[in-house]
């Protein structure tokens, strides 16, 4: 058993049929010694008396808010949550496996630049009685500070018969050094509590590996005289690290119709302009990627050909 | 050329060669990017490699003030990785595919380090740790980790030379 926060405790249980469970001793936070009784949740049934209560925690029915009273007055609470371990593996029932970039990916994180600011998100089908708390650091043995905000519900989607909820959190490294080569990864830890179930999820990454620039901005077309070609130009996204002579991007320019199966023109360039062939009913799209490190491509920025 | 006395390097040549190094480092093992090597206990491996750190003057302001500190750090790293790529980690079993770009990578590391430091001038170099994995699978894992780390190192070096070529070239 360990303390998650004040008056909230997590009991770690090996979860299998007829498991013996864990013996837990609760102590009432009071100077009083006599006349103390214990109840669980809203029940008025007295579970025991005395300053301490010893219980055998085996299942979710044994978890909950234990309260010690004296003469009708509440003295203190202890909330017990369960953390299940099945076949040596901690349960991951609360969050959905996003399976990208690999199986057992529950947390996904992205950064728009090298400033040390990043966003992580996760998915669940649970809509109520759900709380998250996020902590982060650079490195684990001698951790350096990363400050995370509160996790918020950022999107709701319907997937078949189910509703899916996306939560996200923004974090900022306290003393970021954008130009340095990272040697210690960022660690992100998410505590998830659904009713009386506790789970924790972790992710470890270098900012350089989660970089995904915003799409290029201000796409403009200039038709070339006596030619089917147009010159397309764009600018670096505002959110990208500066100066651009140091933090350089490379670009992919593509002309394609509405369907992915349609024919296309495609060219890669380090410049902020390119010459392509525009077709009626097609769009010109441009996306960006760090020039020197193969992290994710940005989403496409598009303008119609006409 | 970046001579220990303090003259400027051939920024444009360094830019071209460092960008080539980036391409090579990713083609040497593109799939490295999809392996989560941090799960494998990095301590003895990549803690010993020279990283370009915050105080090394490789940021745009530091380069403007005095590029020598940064260039020396880059030079140290190039020599270090060049030695690693020539060590039995890469030459031993399992043999690298003959078409692996590791050979070109090795030669290009040497080429860039020579551009930065002509013969006859000597900067301090870092000792290469004695990493002698006994099992072929350990050697394979070590290669992946070294290449992954090299990808990060050459990315920073390429940024330095691109910025230098754009803003510090005579």
């Amino acid at each position: 058993i360990w303390e998650l926060k004040k008056d909230v405790y997590v009991v770690e249980l090996d979860w299998y049929p007829d498991a013996p469970g864990e013996m837990v001793v609760l102590t009432c936070d009071t100077p009083e010694e006599d006349g103390i009784t214990w109840t669980l949740d809203q029940s008025s049934e007295v579970l025991g008396s005395g300053k301490t209560l010893t219980i055998q925690v085996k299942e979710f029915g044994d978890a909950g808010q234990y309260t010690c009273h004296k003469g009708g007055e509440v003295l203190s609470h202890s909330l017990l949550l369960l953390h299940k371990k099945e076949d040596g593996i901690w349960s991951t029932d609360i969050l959905k496996d996003q399976k990208e970039p690999k199986n057992k990916t529950f947390l996904r994180c992205e950064a728009k630049n090298y400033s040390g600011r990043f966003t992580c998100w996760w998915l669940t089908t649970i809509s109520t009685d759900l709380t998250f708390s996020v902590k982060s650091s650079r490195g684990s043995s001698d951790p350096q500070g990363v400050t995370c905000g509160a996790a918020t519900l950022s999107a709701e989607r319907v997937r078949g018969d189910n509703k899916e909820y996306e939560y996200s959190v923004e974090c900022q490294e306290d003393s970021a050094c954008p130009a340095a080569e990272e040697s210690l990864p960022i660690e992100v830890m998410v505590d998830a509590v659904h009713k009386l179930k506790y789970e924790n999820y972790t992710s470890s990454f270098f900012i350089r590996d989660i970089i995904k620039p915003d799409p290029p901005k201000n796409l403009q077309l200039k038709p070339l005289k006596n030619s089917r070609q147009v010159e397309v130009s764009w600018e670096y996204p505002d959110t990208w690290s500066t100066p651009h002579s140091y933090f350089s991007l490379t670009f992919c320019v593509q002309v394609q119709g509405k369907s992915k199966r349609e024919k296309k023109d495609r060219v890669f360039t380090d410049k902020t302009s390119a010459t392509v062939i525009c077709r009626k009913n097609a769009s010109i799209s441009v996306r960006a990627q760090d020039r020197y490190y193969s992290s994710s491509w940005s989403e496409w920025a598009s303008v119609p050909c006409s | 050329r970046a001579v220990p006395g303090g003259s400027s390097p051939a920024w444009t040549q360094c830019q071209q060669l460092s960008q080539k190094l980036c391409t090579l480092a990713w083609s040497a093992h593109p799939l490295v990017g999809h392996m989560d090597l941090r799960e494998e206990g990095d301590e003895e491996t990549t803690n010993d490699v020279p990283h370009i750190q915050c105080g090394d003057g490789c940021d745009p302001q530091g380069l403007r003030d005095n590029s020598q500190f940064c260039l020396q750090r880059i030079h140290q790293g190039l020599i270090f990785y060049e030695k690693l790529l020539g060590s039995d980690i890469f030459t031993g079993e399992p043999s690298l595919l003959p078409d692996s770009p590791v050979g070109q990578l090795h030669a290009s590391l040497l080429g860039l380090s020579q551009l930065l430091q002509p013969e006859g001038h000597h900067w301090e170099t870092q000792q290469i740790p004695s990493l002698s994995p006994s099992q072929p699978w350990q050697r394979l894992l070590l290669r992946f980790k070294i290449l992954r780390s090299l990808q990060a190192f050459v990315a920073v070096a390429a940024r330095v030379f691109a910025h230098g070529a754009a803003t510090l070239s005579p």
């Epitope: 349609e262 024919k263 077709r279 009626k280 | -």
Partner: antibody, heavy 118, light 107 residues
Framework: EVQLVQSGAEVKKPGATVKISCKAS????????LHWVRQAPEKGLEWMGW????????EYAPKFQGRVTITADTSTDTGYLELSSLRSEDTAVYYC???????????WGQGTLVTVSS | DIQMTQSPSSVSASVGDRVTITCRAS??????LHWYQQKPGKAPKLLIK???QSISGVPSRFSGYGSGTDFSLTINSLQPEDFARYYC?????????FGGGTKVEIK
Amino acid sequence: EVQLVQSGAEVKKPGATVKISCKASGYTFSDYYLHWVRQAPEKGLEWMGWIDPENGDTEYAPKFQGRVTITADTSTDTGYLELSSLRSEDTAVYYCAANKELRYFDVWGQGTLVTVSS
Amino acid sequence: DIQMTQSPSSVSASVGDRVTITCRASQSISINLHWYQQKPGKAPKLLIKFASQSISGVPSRFSGYGSGTDFSLTINSLQPEDFARYYCQQSNSFPLTFGGGTKVEIK
């Protein structure tokens, strides 16, 4: 199977015009760009131009501008290359090539030898 | 026009050898470079697109690398059917241009 079948060899006199054809099968003709590339005996490859059969848009290499016409007939799934004012250095194997991507060549015809000789 | 220079113009090798052909562009072309194989009397065949992207059905012994102005095609463990001429082609800008070709012949 995507296939391009070209017309047979031609012998032409200098100053004449040649028109060769390229019949597509195994795909929707207007879904691919069609290019023409030539290769002089024992020489390298030389790109001449392309057509978008969907709308008739064309682009020619400056070297051939004014002498070359590329057309496409969607009713017969056939592309054509017409080269006028022939000279001896136009003696070459002419290939049609197609792709959904404009700038490289995925599928090739078998080639048509055009000999220009007086 | 962008000039493409291939080297060597010919190379003699034996079955099982590793052969590397290089291609240099007269200006930076990013990764807009493709490789073709041509056997005598036949049309060219696409081997690699955009410098290093493999083509389905092409044996994995063919690999490409490069960016900017310098590119290479490597044939690892040369097979009897690989003796042919190889061409690079840039697609950075029109007109599309090819290298002069490299002939891989039997030693």
